[in-house]
Amino acid sequence: GQNITARIGEPLVLKCKGAPKKPPQQLEWKLNTGRTEAWKVLSPQGGSWDSVAHVLPNGSLLLPAVGIQDEGTFRCRTTNRNGKETKSNYRVRVYQIPGKPEILDPASELTAGIPSKVGTCVSDGGYPLGTLSWHMDGKLLVPDGKGVSVKEQTRRHPDTGLFTLQSELMVTPAGGGGPPPTFSCSFSPGLPRRRASYTAPIQPSVWEPGPLEVRLLVEPEGGAVAPGETVTLTCEAPAQPPPQIHWMKDGMSLPLPPSPVLLLPEVGPQDEGTYSCVATHPNRGPQESLPISISVETGEDGPTAGSEGGSGLGTLALA
């Protein structure tokens, strides 16, 4: 048999080999396609199938406008005037070249060290299914789930059966002050064997954030408090996503869950010391605040009555 590739919407003529050039002809066309369930023999007189396929006076079969449902097998059998039988067999596949791919919502700026959306590449109106690929500085980007990730979506138009492909690219750009990377997207058709078509390239700038600024605030101000008062320590580290905050006392990590606020209720001498907070950001590592000293003013009589000494951790609370 012969493989035929036809463009959707275009006419297609299949020759019935060995058929007399004009009637009378002894020939039979039959087809098995998306429009049939088994073999359909076409009536030589024509009829309701004529809009899809009909036999021409020379015995060829005309498909006036090929559609997706016409993919399949077409066979002709003819007997010439000497009684010799000839068979023709065609395997028809169809295609439609989509519009040039484009990048929607292209990013103007990416943040170094942070996963950032580059854009969404769209190819509309193709058949059969092709593939979208991303390129950075001319090289194919392979998703690794870490620094490069791609989210793909395929939709099929309910009426035409044509495909729309979408591919969203996320990258975690490296810092280092080199030239910003150039991104492009390409569509490779499933049929026929054709070169890929490319979008225009985009070149978002890469912003490199400085180190985290971590500030520690204390209430009441100054850090000198009377016994039994409550001290509130607040750690500020503006960043997206919000960093995790851990607390230190006298250079030792406090065994508490992360929180931006540390409460010291009813302070006693055991709570005295130097406090700092450590902000840990997924893309920027840990950054420690300047320390703050907490002192409990006990008056002239020595330690406050009833205070227990020790680490004082039993009295700490996280807001």
Epitope: R35, T36, E37, A38, K40, S43, Q45, G46, G47, S48, W49, D50, S51, V52
Partner: antibody
Framework: EVQLVESGGGLVQPGRSLKLSCVVS????????MTWIRQTPGKGLEWVAS????????YYPDSVKDRFTISRDNAKSTLYLQMNSLRSEDTATYYC????????????WGQGVMVTVSS | DIQMTQSPSSMSVSLGDTITITCRAS??????VNWFQQKPGKSPRRMIY???NLADGVPSRFSGSRSGSIYSLTISSLESEDVADYHC?????????FGSGTKVEIK
């Protein structure tokens, strides 16, 4: 909204002629095959004639072949049925319908027009 | 020519009943069978296309099925507005052929 409006029916003597028209709106006329179907009083439906979208192919059952002619004017979005040598058995309500090929199986119908063949 | 043998010719049923009308094709017509509803004094309305597909705006109590050369229209939980004549049609081969019709009425 898709509309098909037939006209031209009436009482006619056997052997005489009559021409039915069907003006359509609400869709791209030249994208579709069109068909005339008739219904005799108290009886079933019968296919009368079909025409392809360009108008260059026409199809008839033996009962009306060589007497009836289906045609179309795509510029006017109008379908016609020229009926010659009318017989009493042609008495029926005639419907104009969209379709006739395997891709569109009569999804829209006109309101029908009555043709009575009687002396 | 293809014959479409439709049965029954009429049926008298109760509201809420489930009914099935069948058409037998005398030769293979594939999926190319439609069902039409026709109320008195009105034009036919397509209900099922290509044997099993529900036409736009048709209530889901209507369904079409096929077993070999037998095509069926089923109305589940019949309502008063379903009282009508029902016709099948094969449009695979010329001459296009309708069934003889089934009249559905309420007891």
């Amino acid at each position: 909204e898709v509309q098909l409006v037939e006209s031209g029916g009436g009482l006619v003597q056997p052997g005489r002629s009559l021409k039915l028209s069907c003006v359509v709106s609400g869709f791209t006329f030249n994208n579709y095959w069109m068909t005339w179907i008739r219904q005799t009083p108290g009886k079933g439906l019968e296919w009368v004639a079909s025409i392809n979208n360009s108008g260059d192919n026409t199809y008839y059952p033996d009962s009306v072949k060589d007497r009836f002619t289906i045609s179309r004017d795509n510029a006017k979005s109008t379908l016609y049925l020229q009926m010659n040598s009318l017989r009493s058995e042609d008495t029926a309500t005639y419907y104009c319908t969209r379709g006739g090929d395997i891709t569109t199986g009569f999804d829209y119908w006109g309101q029908g027009v009555m043709v009575t063949v009687s002396s | 020519d293809i014959q479409m043998t439709q049965s029954p010719s009429s049926m008298s049923v109760s509201l809420g009943d489930t009914i099935t009308i069948t058409c037998r094709a005398s030769q293979d017509v594939g999926i190319y069978v439609n069902w039409f509803q026709q109320k008195p004094g009105k034009s036919p309305r397509r209900m099922i296309y290509r044997a099993t597909n529900l036409a736009d705006g048709v209530p889901s109590r209507f369904s079409g099925s096929r077993s070999g050369s037998i095509y069926s229209l089923t109305i589940s939980s019949l309502e008063s507005e379903d009282v009508a004549d029902y016709h099948c049609l094969e449009f695979d081969e010329h001459p296009l052929t309708f069934g003889s019709g089934t009249k559905v009425e309420i007891k």
